[in-house]
Interface confidence: low
């Protein structure tokens, strides 16, 4: 009786026993067995199928024949079958097991095919707990990761298989515990167009960060109040609060404060002057009588009621610069002229603060003639 | 070592349909999958398809999804590509190509020629 | 899918030189690149694969290299018996795609 069966296969391989022995038609029963534990019996000569192979099954076979009750007359010879390992059990590396949090880490899935196999083609799929990574299995025995956070800490492992699914082997899991970092110096600035904060545009409150990891709470306070105007929560260094159109009654002392789940750290306190632009100013004549005449001294007076100082007005004779003057402080400013009869037409003014400029209306003035006789001065302003 | 032996070639009339065989030798033939590519005259190679010999699962390049059906035979070690509703468009030379991904090992290729 | 352009249809060099022959992938597929050698009425040959792996028995006169998009092969000392089309592939994502082709002349 002679068992035929090959002597050195690997995992996944098929592997089939044949039992040989003359005069088939006189076996009532035949047996495979393997380190002396009866695998099967069957009724007549048949193969023994082992459909995918798996260390355990390296052992001792033989095959026996009985026809008789309990007794096995013929016993086969014994074949050694030795089932190779087709690759390791991968070994899961990473990059870092403690990264830093918003920073990449490459994952590996590390595995060695037999040196009688190396055409065998494997593929990989990476975990998190008992997530997926990435898009899944794949080729490569490698994966990046672009970014981690602090939820992405916890246990990993891999998986490697044949691409038929024959094979299939998980690595050990290993612990990534991903690292936040404090936040660091909070700073608030001021972003505004022009680098000025201007009554009607638009202001931007800009929270940073020098340092700190993951999701940051960035909050906005006006210290007269100690009330919070916003609240942002992201991944960034920074956050901005938009005010659409700054009001006057916005001017005064701000901060914010940066919090990512450790000690909330608070900005320095930033003052905010709004600046206004001037409005439309009004031009004043002024003159000793109630009507001007050729040598009269007239005085030109405009003002603009709103406006941050310093205020320049300058005073216009139809479309000739007469002269200029400033308001330091604010309020209105004054100029002189002594009459001929070549002053007479429209007189206007300009307020300008750096915000933008404002002309007055036109005041038409009639000076009288030498033959004495005075005409109306009127005044106008708006 | 490793073969793909493919069938001869074929001609065929337009609307017809066509069944081309390619028998593995040499290696173990459920344990690597069988690509189909697709060769016209004077241009690139297009891959077609592939199929997983050990389950018969398919994947297919959607362009070839209504032209082409993938099977196996494991008694006998053969993958088989059958084109369907043929026009003289499909007039190529078709190779079978072992692997998942790269394929390291290709048939002869089976020239097709489809003409009234 | 992904468009694998060889912008050298045509490359022409001598024995002994050294000639590079390149593919740009229309998006990144890593280093999922394959190279194949055809010689005029044979079936496709794989060089290299990943993209740097010769494969069984290819020379290493043969070389590549690249990731992303980029890719290239590099024959260093051409032989005569290197006359032939050379195919780079994608195998980064369904379907998988090959390149025009650059056809190598032999002066």
């Known amino acids: 009786l002679t068992l035929v069966a090959p002597s050195s296969v690997f995992e996944g391989d098929s592997i089939v026993l044949k039992c040989q022995g003359e005069q088939n038609w006189k076996i009532q029963k035949m047996a495979y067995h393997k380190d002396n534990k009866e695998l099967s019996v069957f009724k007549k000569f048949s193969d023994f199928l082992i459909q995918s192979a798996v260390l355990s099954d390296s052992g001792n076979y033989f095959c026996s024949t009985k026809g008789q009750l309990f007794l096995w007359d013929k016993t086969s010879n014994i074949v050694k079958i030795k089932v190779q390992e087709l690759f390791q059990r991968p070994v899961l590396t990473a990059s870092s097991f403690q990264p830093i949090e918003g920073g990449p880490v490459s994952l590996k899935c590390e595995t060695r095919l037999s040196p009688q196999r190396l055409d065998v083609q494997l593929q990989f799929c990476f975990f998190r707990e008992n997530q997926v990574l990435g898009s899944g299995w794949s080729s490569s025995p490698e994966l990046q990761i672009s970014a981690v956070w602090s939820e992405d800490t916890g246990s990993y492992w891999c998986k490697a298989e044949t691409v038929t699914h024959r094979i299939r082997k998980q690595s050990l899991q290993s612990q990534i515990h991903v690292q936040r970092i404090p936040i660091s110096n909070v700073s608030l600035e001021i972003r505004a167009p022009g680098g000025q904060v201007t009554e009607g545009q638009k202001l931007i409150l800009l929270c940073s960060v020098a340092g700190g990891t993951g999701n940051v709470t960035f909050s906005w306070y006006r210290e007269a109040t100690g009330t919070s105007m916003g609240k942002k929560t992201q991944r960034s260094l920074s956050a901005e609060l938009e005010i659409p159109a700054v009001k006057e009654s916005d001017a005064g002392k701000y901060y914010c404060r940066a919090d990512n789940g450790h000690v909330p750290i608070q900005s320095k306190v930033v003052n905010i002057p709004v600046r206004i632009p001037v409005s439309r100013p009004v031009l004043t004549l002024r003159s000793p009588g109630a009507q001007a005449a050729v040598g009269d001294l007239l005085e030109l007076h405009c003002e603009a009621l709103r406006g941050s100082p310093p205020i320049l007005y300058q005073f216009y004779h139809e479309d000739v610069t007469l002269g200029n003057s400033s308001a330091p402080s604010g309020g209105g400013a004054s100029f002189n002229l002594s009459l001929t009869a070549e002053h007479s037409g429209n007189y206007s003014c300009e307020a300008n603060n750096g915000l933008g400029a404002q002309c007055s209306e036109a005041v038409p003035v009639s000076i009288s003639g030498p033959d004495g006789y005075r005409r109306d001065l009127m005044t106008a302003g708006v | 070592q490793v073969q793909l032996q493919q069938s001869g070639p074929e001609l065929v009339k337009p609307g017809a349909s066509v069944k081309i065989s390619c028998k593995a030798s040499?290696?173990?033939?459920?344990?690597?999958?069988m690509n189909w590519v697709k060769q016209s005259h004077g241009k690139s190679p297009e891959w077609i398809g592939r199929?997983?010999?050990?389950?018969?699962?398919?994947f297919f390049n959607q362009n070839f999804k209504d032209k082409a059906t993938l099977t196996v035979d494991k008694s006998s070690n053969t993958a088989h590509m059958e084109l369907l509703s043929l026009t003289s468009d499909d007039s190529a030379v078709y190779y079978c190509?072992?692997?998942?991904?790269?394929?390291?090992?290709w048939g002869q290729g089976t020239t097709l020629t489809v003409s009234s | 899918d992904i468009v694998m352009t060889q912008s050298h249809k045509f490359m022409s060099t001598s024995v002994g030189d050294r000639v590079s022959i390149t593919c740009k992938a229309s998006?990144?597929?890593?280093?999922?690149v394959a190279w194949y050698q055809q010689k005029p009425g044979q079936s496709p040959k794989l060089l290299i694969f990943?993209?740097?792996t010769r494969h069984t028995g290819v020379p290493d006169r043969f070389t590549g290299s690249g990731s992303g998009t980029d890719f290239t092969l590099t024959i260093g000392n051409v032989q005569s018996e290197d006359l032939a089309d050379y195919f780079c592939?994608?195998?980064?994502?369904?379907?998988?795609?090959f390149g025009g082709g650059t056809k190598l002349e032999i002066k």
């Open positions: 190509g072992r692997g998942l991904y790269y394929l390291n090992y």
């Open positions: 040499g290696f173990s033939f459920t344990a690597y999958f």
């Open positions: 199929i997983n010999p050990y389950n018969g699962e398919t």
């Open positions: 998006q990144d597929v890593g280093t999922a």
């Open positions: 990943w993209p740097s």
């Open positions: 592939q994608q195998f980064s994502s369904l379907p998988h795609t």
